[in-house]
């Protein structure tokens, strides 16, 4: 009896090995049919809509990143409480698992548009440089099922690049107007949504916990309409200190208002930013190394 | 450490109204949707609907659209289910949770016993 | 509404031993789905998210996987914490909704 119990003991020591060896087999094959559809989806640099099939659904581009698959394009995410999936652009560098939630490269895009359009998002799904708002709605979704931060890459037109980090992004739900809140601010381009910079201006300046306003819908702390004034969207407080959905000029810019994209903390208000990448990813992302 | 901390038991006449609590700790209360689950004696879960405390926005499953009915005080950070015109078949362990991608926390559930 | 068919209903098991629960969903659920573990006690974790991938603590003896529209919880060696009440839950749509659940006792 007693050797029959060290037998059985063998055997299912033997067959968990079994189970592990077969579980790393079954990841490298995984790994390379996923490498194998990727690079026959990767149908060059322009057009970049990576079709995964019904097989799973992902909430986030973390979860795509996590689960092998290693190219930048645009895939389908269903966040959480989303009552189904959209497109949106996986920025799988810097680290990998970043989903892109605004883009702003060539001035291809009207960005002065209502309420329903930044609700809904509107631009360019399609290609790698294509400009798009991903829509407050997917954002408050995105936002809610976890704790995430926001990158914003700001490039110039002299080939200067810095960043801006913010902890702890969430976007409210309609009934709250999209309500931004961010938490603590690191980075190389100047803390220009809390409005830390300098606090005399904090007041009118900062972003923190504003309602998102539209040309249509004016949620601002401004006697007159800030959306209207710089024609885009965006969680104005009278009016800004970073307007990254503003009118695309080419640099120093002239206007009535300061409607360029704007960062103040590194080029001020009059100077209109060559491309702008908005991307989030969970707080505590660890990439799933195989 | 996140928790959720549910009131204690509660017995009630057929036809009367409950209102039980669900606080939040360790977190910001208004960043998340807490769920709320029903689970009768002895029997199965059901998800019985959330609200977002950032907002007070709601979605109920159908079933229980005329039955439960949650708010949220956002000073205590607490979120509350009322239960309207009991019957025996409300009596159950009521859960509230909260969902998110990487983690799930539960409360410990509260009893309602409808009895006359 | 998704229905979830779960089995066994109840399941007797001894210590050291791999079990298997599944869950079928009547619709597309696409890997939307979680285990949970009640203890006798009525506490509720989740062990499971997103069909396979652990949540964190949980011991490594728990598995999930999908096959189709059924998917599986898989405990590799009974130990007898183990023991107690396990659910599946969708949530790829509103309303969520769970598997009938799976006792699981010391035989």
């Known amino acids: 009896l007693e050797d029959c119990a060290q037998e059985q003991m063998r055997l299912r020591a033997q067959v968990r090995l079994l189970e592990t060896r077969v579980k790393q087999q079954q990841v490298k094959i995984k790994q390379l049919l996923q490498e194998n559809e990727v690079q026959f989806l990767d149908k060059g640099d322009e057009n970049t809509v990576i079709d995964l099939g019904s097989k799973r659904q992902y909430a986030d581009c973390s979860e795509i990143f996590n689960d092998g698959y290693k190219l930048s394009g645009f895939y389908k995410i269903k966040p959480l409480q989303s009552p189904a999936e959209f497109s949106v652009y996986c920025d799988m560098s810097d680290g990998g698992g970043w989903t892109v939630i605004q883009r702003r490269s060539d001035g291809s895009e009207n960005f002065n548009r209502g309420w329903k359009d930044y609700e809904n998002g509107f631009g360019n799904f399609v290609q790698k440089h294509g400009e798009y708002w991903l829509g407050n709605k997917n954002l408050h979704f995105l936002t809610t099922q976890e704790d995430y931060t926001l990158k914003i890459d700001l490039a110039d037109f002299e080939k200067n690049s810095r960043y801006a980090q913010y902890k702890n992004f969430k976007v409210g739900d309609e009934k709250n107007f999209y309500e931004l809140n961010i938490g603590e601010y690191s980075g190389t381009a100047g803390d220009s949504l809390a409005g830390n910079f300098h606090p005399e201006v904090q007041w009118w300046a900062s972003h923190q916990r504003m309602k998102f306003s539209t040309w249509d819908r004016d949620h601002d702390n401004y006697e007159g309409n800030c959306a209207e004034e710089d024609q885009s969207g965006w969680w104005f407080n009278r009016c800004h200190s970073a307007n990254l959905n503003g009118v695309y000029y080419s640099g120093p810019y002239t206007a009535k208002t300061d409607n360029g994209i704007v960062w103040y903390t590194w080029h001020g208000w009059w100077y209109s930013l060559k491309s702008v990448v908005m991307k989030i990813r969970p707080n505590d992302f660890i990439p799933n190394v195989i | 450490e996140v928790q959720l901390q549910q009131s204690g038991p509660e017995l009630v006449k057929p036809g009367a109204s409950v209102k039980i609590s669900c606080k939040a700790s360790?977190?910001?209360?208004?960043?998340?949707?807490i769920n709320w689950v029903k689970q009768k004696p002895g029997q199965g879960l059901e998800w019985i609907g959330w609200?977002?405390?950032?907002?007070?926005?709601?979605d109920h499953n159908e079933k229980f659209k005329d039955k439960a009915t949650l708010t949220v005080d956002t000073s205590s950070s607490t979120a509350y289910m009322q239960l309207s015109s009991l019957t025996s078949e409300d009596t159950a362990v009521y859960f509230c949770?909260?969902?998110?991608?990487?983690?799930?926390?539960w409360g410990q559930g509260t009893l309602v016993t409808v009895s006359a | 509404d998704i229905q979830m068919t779960q089995s066994p209903s109840s399941l007797s098991a001894s210590l050291g031993e791999r079990v298997s629960l599944t869950c079928r969903a009547s619709q597309e659920i696409s890997g939307y789905l979680s285990w949970l573990q009640q203890k006798p006690d009525g506490t509720i974790k989740r062990l499971i998210y997103a069909a396979s991938t652990l949540d964190s603590g949980v011991p490594k003896r728990f598995s999930g996987s999908r096959s189709g529209s059924d998917y599986s919880l898989t405990i590799s060696s009974l130990e007898s914490e183990d023991f107690a009440d396990y659910y599946c839950l969708q949530y790829a749509s509103y309303p969520w909704t769970f598997g009938g659940g799976t006792k699981l006792e010391i035989k």
């Open positions: 360790g977190y910001t209360f208004t960043d998340y949707y």
């Open positions: 609200i977002y405390p950032g907002s007070g926005n709601t």
């Open positions: 949770l909260r969902f998110l991608l990487r983690s799930a926390y």
